[in-house]
Interface confidence: low
């Protein structure tokens, strides 16, 4: 990070950057490097792509070491072949309403995701796809055996547990928070983001957190038992310290990671939580970053291409972590 030292570049020749990635001078004006892209970790030495209007957002003033590449206010979004202005809302399909915010797209479901408990007037609710309707709707089945009504009602509660939370309605603000996106890296330290308006003034904002689905150095396939095809959540032998651009977590963590499969399925986090992690850097500086911690993983065939950032809106969501991290504030 320190620019006071003599320039030392990793390679004599300029690196070959992937299509659409700019070749830029590092922050010290020394070496030509491939610019970091939206949502990637950035440092003084690893700058963000200026041609896409990105800047390195270091977050908290104290964290001047490592940031996340963020689009400047007002950057447009490209989604499904169309360009949308920052602040513009659109429907990606009949089921999702999306908003472009500074280069990132956040989508919220238009179809009700409610869970319907049995009630006296609807003892056997069932969701069905009706012709000509986009969203599935609840229908009430008559029980074949009238005596079945009794046990079904055991789950019924007077309060509508799954109704909208009135404490989140503020000044006509319908609070909406997208699920956390998939981790930007399949192994090693990456970034996961979401869009929310769950803040005092109902403003859309992006939140980010560090994430690690699995360590890169782990050879997890070796641990798959004979006859099995997957190891969903491998046991971690010893507590680990996380590393982030030369800085090391102050505490050790007995973290859960996701395993691997040998049958073409991929294992991704299913339930997660977000906790602050303090990192100590070689110069003694301490910085605090929010990080995803895995509770459970799921193995499935929905393995979108790693470069398709939008597929993660549909396939690789992470649940169980909608509470404000301070949120985020």
């Amino acid at each position: 990070q320190d620019c006071s030292a003599q320039c030392q570049c990793a390679a004599e020749a300029a690196p070959h950057c992937p299509a659409g990635v700019s070749l830029v001078l590092d922050g010290c004006g020394c070496c030509r490097v491939c610019a970091k892209q939206l949502g990637e970790l950035c440092t003084e030495r690893d700058p963000c792509d200026p041609h896409k209007g990105l800047f390195c957002d270091f977050g908290s003033p104290a964290n001047r070491k490592i940031g996340v590449c963020t689009a400047k206010d007002g950057a447009p979004c490209v989604f499904g072949g169309s360009v949308y202005r920052s602040g513009e809302s659109f429907q990606s399909s009949c089921k999702y309403q999306c908003t472009c915010l500074d280069g990132a797209v956040g989508c919220v479901p238009l179809c009700s995701m409610d869970v319907r408990l049995p009630s006296p007037d609807c003892p056997f609710p069932r969701r069905v796809k009706l012709p000509g309707k986009c969203c599935e709707e609840w229908v009430c089945d008559e029980p074949k055996d009238r005596t079945a009504v009794g046990p079904a009602l055991a789950a019924y509660r007077l309060e509508d547990t799954f109704g909208p939370d009135p404490t989140m309605m503020r000044a006509n603000c319908l609070v909406q928070t997208t699920e956390w996106s998939a981790c930007s890296k399949t192994c090693g330290m990456g970034i996961s983001t979401r869009v929310t308006n769950d803040n005092t003034f109902c403003r859309l904002e992006k939140q980010s957190r560090l994430c690690m689905v699995r360590p890169c150095e782990a050879d997890l396939e070796e641990n798959i038992k004979k006859g099995k095809k997957c190891i969903r959540t491998p046991k971690i032998a010893k507590p680990v310290k996380f590393e982030l651009s030369g800085c090391t977590s102050v505490k050790t963590y007995r973290a859960k990671f996701c395993g691997v499969c040998t049958d073409g399925r991929c294992c991704t986090p299913h339930r997660t939580t977000t906790l602050p992690v303090e990192f100590k850097c070689p110069d003694g500086e301490i910085m605090k970053k929010n990080m995803m911690f895995i509770k459970t993983c799921a193995c499935h065939y929905n393995c979108p291409g790693d470069n398709d950032i939008f597929e993660s809106l549909y396939y690789r969501k992470m649940y169980g972590d909608m509470a404000h991290h301070h949120h985020h504030h």
Epitope: G59, S60, P61, D73, T167, R170, N199, T200, F201, R203, E205, K288, A323, H324, H325, H326, H329
Partner: antibody
Framework: EVTLKESGPVLVKPTETLTLTCTVS????????VHWIRQPPGKGLEWLGV???????DYNAAFMSRLTISKDTSKSQVVFTMTNMDPVDTATYYC????????WGQGTTVTVSS | ESVVTQPPSVSGAPGQRVTISCRSS?????????ANWVQQLPGTAFKGLIG???NRAPGVPDRFSGSKSGTSASLAITGLQAEDEADYYC?????????FGGGTKLTVLG
């Protein structure tokens, strides 16, 4: 009508722990967060910490190791605890509602002296 | 560490327009700093005027407005009145904490 009222000891000895309570009315602690701010005599405001409506907390880094903020939503009370008090902590302590710091308590003056 | 700077004092005659600046030491003020403005009338409690850069608190007259530009947030008061004489504080949010400015004493002349 929205009101916040701080209560607690007026005098605290050095090294002792200060515990203040902010009792609110006119709104629910599950709808709004509550901040704690202090003002030393003749000086400006210093933000100490906040408990958000969902119970999460953020603290001023300078007081992180000494400060705890908790709440009892059913009693409409927020409790502020600061350990290891020092004469430099002599100030008027305020609680204020989140949402643009729109409503404040009257403040309680705390003197730290042996 | 972030420092938030306000002018110690400003003054204006009744009916005039005054602005109070609130400068962030660590770069541009953005919507994510949720600039807040608080008024302390002499001998009375505090009252929130503006939150989220430009949102007026309930009951605050539209003579008070908030904005941001570059590294500063600003509070503007138009049609200055004698009862506006008070101390004004800004507060900026930095990801995990608020920082208050040192306060500005507004004197209404005449």
């Amino acid at each position: 009508e929205v009101t916040l009222k701080e209560s607690g000891p007026v005098l605290v000895k050095p090294t002792e722990t200060l515990t203040l309570t902010c009792t609110v009315s006119g709104f629910s602690l599950s709808t709004f967060g509550v901040h704690w701010i202090r003002q030393p005599p003749g000086k400006g405001l210093e933000w100490l910490g906040v408990i958000w409506r969902r119970g999460g907390t953020d603290y001023n880094a300078a007081f992180m190791s000494r400060l705890t903020i908790s709440k009892d939503t059913s009693k409409s009370q927020v409790v502020f605890t600061m350990t290891n008090m020092d004469p430099v902590d002599t100030a008027t302590y305020y609680c204020a509602r989140d949402g643009g710091f729109d409503y404040w308590g009257q403040g309680t003056t705390v003197t730290v002296s042996s | 560490e972030s420092v938030v700077t306000q002018p110690p004092s400003v003054s204006g005659a009744p009916g005039q327009r005054v602005t109070i600046s609130c400068r962030s030491s660590i770069g541009a003020v953005t919507t994510s700093n949720y600039a807040n403005w608080v008024q302390q009338l002499p001998g009375t409690a505090f009252k929130g005027l503006i939150g989220g850069t430009s949102n007026r608190a309930p009951g605050v007259p539209d003579r008070f407005s908030g904005s941001k530009s570059g590294t500063s947030a600003s509070l503007a008061i138009t049609g200055l009145q004698a009862e506006d004489e008070a101390d004004y504080y800004c507060a900026l949010w930095y990801s995990t904490h608020y920082v208050f400015g040192g306060g500005t004493k507004l004197t209404v002349l005449g």
